[in-house]
Interface confidence: medium
């Protein structure tokens, strides 16, 4: 089994986990994807997904987590607004292939959410206010019930993730694999 | 090989605004983020906002929220910044810089990698 | 936002010299740091990526290290063509800040 790698992430509370996860084109695009949360000793937990089959830049929005997957580009957009100390913790993003085991992506990314804002109070938000307005025609999708633990078979490509400041919601805890995206206060 | 080609130097009032162009050409534009960074004279290098094309969220510094307006056409392969009520301290040379982007792991894994050769933007009474 | 320290902000050197700049952030910005080099009149340069990892044809003279607040770039023998301004850069969150630079000049 190839070993997991992990790309580390240091945010202040209510800045914004913004990741893009890269997956081929081809052969996933249409192809149902998730958000995960990977704690100590547990199977992943999907936190959200996208529809199935997935929609081209349509945003679904489960609590404070909103995913948008762009077909052209083979990526997954992931973002976790309003970000809180218990949403620290290990993510990865994940392709839903049924029967199979998901396909998952990129390196996990540990996610540690810290209290206060750094430099000015406010100032984070002030500077993003416009900047992750969740679109009113968001949808919630449902997710499969199964996760599985699974063995990894070839090195998963590389992420990408982003930090901001925006102003939602979203319940979230620990998580596996993702890709990072650029982070703008 | 990508290459970053920015419009040329511009001569302003104080009051006035300025819009630099960055144009890109070869390799990928939409899923990179495309930052400005200015250097005033004899001062340090200042990141002022960014942009990733495909997603069209511009994020700005917070000294430059109220009067820059960062912005890309996906079309062109072209980003923009526009900055609003020049001072003469906006003097400087105004720099368009490209993030990595698919295949690493961050935008930015690998640094603004790629840079444009800088536009002189001079504000002058 | 983050603060980035770089020190000294100036240092004079000579040829096949060995060079420590150093770069300290407010806040733990795990390894996401690269350090670029601006010489006058031209655009800057990257150097170091992901706070040691050398970008693509930069001389293996230059080296990073470092992780969450506390960066260290060293040029290990100075060559004339190394005598430029360097500046560090976290891009752990936005807005990416740099230091405030180190000048390079020779002795």
């Known amino acids: 089994a190839t070993k997991l790698t992990e790309e580390k992430y240091e945010l202040k509370e209510g800045q914004t986990l913004d990741v893009k996860c890269d997956y081929t084109l081809e052969k996933f695009a249409s192809s149902q994807k998730a958000w995960q949360i990977i704690r100590d000793g547990e199977m992943p937990k999907t936190l959200a997904c996208t529809e199935r089959p997935s929609k081209n830049s349509h945003p679904v929005q489960v609590g404070r987590i909103i995913l948008e997957d762009y077909h052209d580009h083979g990526l997954l957009r992931v973002r976790m607004v309003n970000l809180q100390v218990e949403d620290s913790g290990l993510y990865q993003c994940v392709i839903y292939q049924p029967p199979k085991e998901p396909h998952m992506l990129f390196d996990r990314i540990r996610l540690v959410v810290t209290k206060g804002f750094s430099g000015t109070p406010g100032s984070n938000e002030n500077s993003t206010q416009n900047v992750y307005k969740i679109p009113p025609t968001t949808t919630k999708a449902l997710c499969p019930l199964y996760t599985s633990p699974r063995t990894v078979t070839q090195a998963p490509p590389k992420s990408t993730a982003d930090v901001s400041t925006p102003d939602s919601e979203i319940n979230l805890t620990n998580v596996t694999d993702i890709i990072r995206v650029p982070v703008f206060n | 090989q990508v290459q970053l080609v920015q419009s040329g130097a511009e001569v302003k009032r104080p009051g006035s605004s300025v819009k630099v162009s960055c144009k890109a050409s070869g390799g990928t534009f939409s899923i990179y983020v495309i930052s400005w960074v200015r250097q005033a004279p004899g001062q340090g290098l200042e990141w002022m906002g960014g942009i990733i094309p495909l997603f069209g969220t511009p994020n700005y510094a917070q000294q430059f929220q109220d009067r820059v307006t960062i912005t890309a056409d996906e079309s062109t392969r072209t980003a923009y910044m526009e900055l609003n009520s020049l001072k003469s301290e906006d003097t400087a040379v105004y720099y368009c810089?490209?993030?990595?982007?698919?295949?690493?792991?961050?935008?930015?894994?690998?640094?603004?990698?790629?840079w444009g050769q800088g536009t002189t933007v001079t504000v002058s009474s | 936002d983050i603060q980035m320290t770089q020190s000294p902000t100036s240092l004079s050197a000579s040829v096949g010299d060995r060079v420590t700049i150093t770069c300290r952030a407010s806040?733990?910005?795990?390894?996401?740091l690269a350090w670029y080099q601006h010489k006058p009149g031209k655009a800057p340069k990257s150097l170091i990526y992901?706070?040691?990892s050398l970008q693509s044809g930069v001389p293996s003279r230059f080296s990073g290290s470092g992780s969450g607040t506390d960066f260290t770039l060293t040029i290990s023998s100075l060559q004339p063509e190394d005598f430029a301004t360097y500046y560090c850069?976290?891009?752990?969150?936005?807005?990416?800040?740099f230091g405030q630079g180190t000048k390079l000049e020779i002795k």
């Open positions: 992901a706070a040691s």
């Open positions: 806040q733990g910005i795990s390894s996401w």
């Open positions: 850069q976290q891009y752990n969150s936005y807005p990416y800040t």
């Open positions: 810089a490209r993030g990595h982007g698919p295949g690493s792991s961050h935008y930015s894994y690998y640094g603004l990698d790629v």
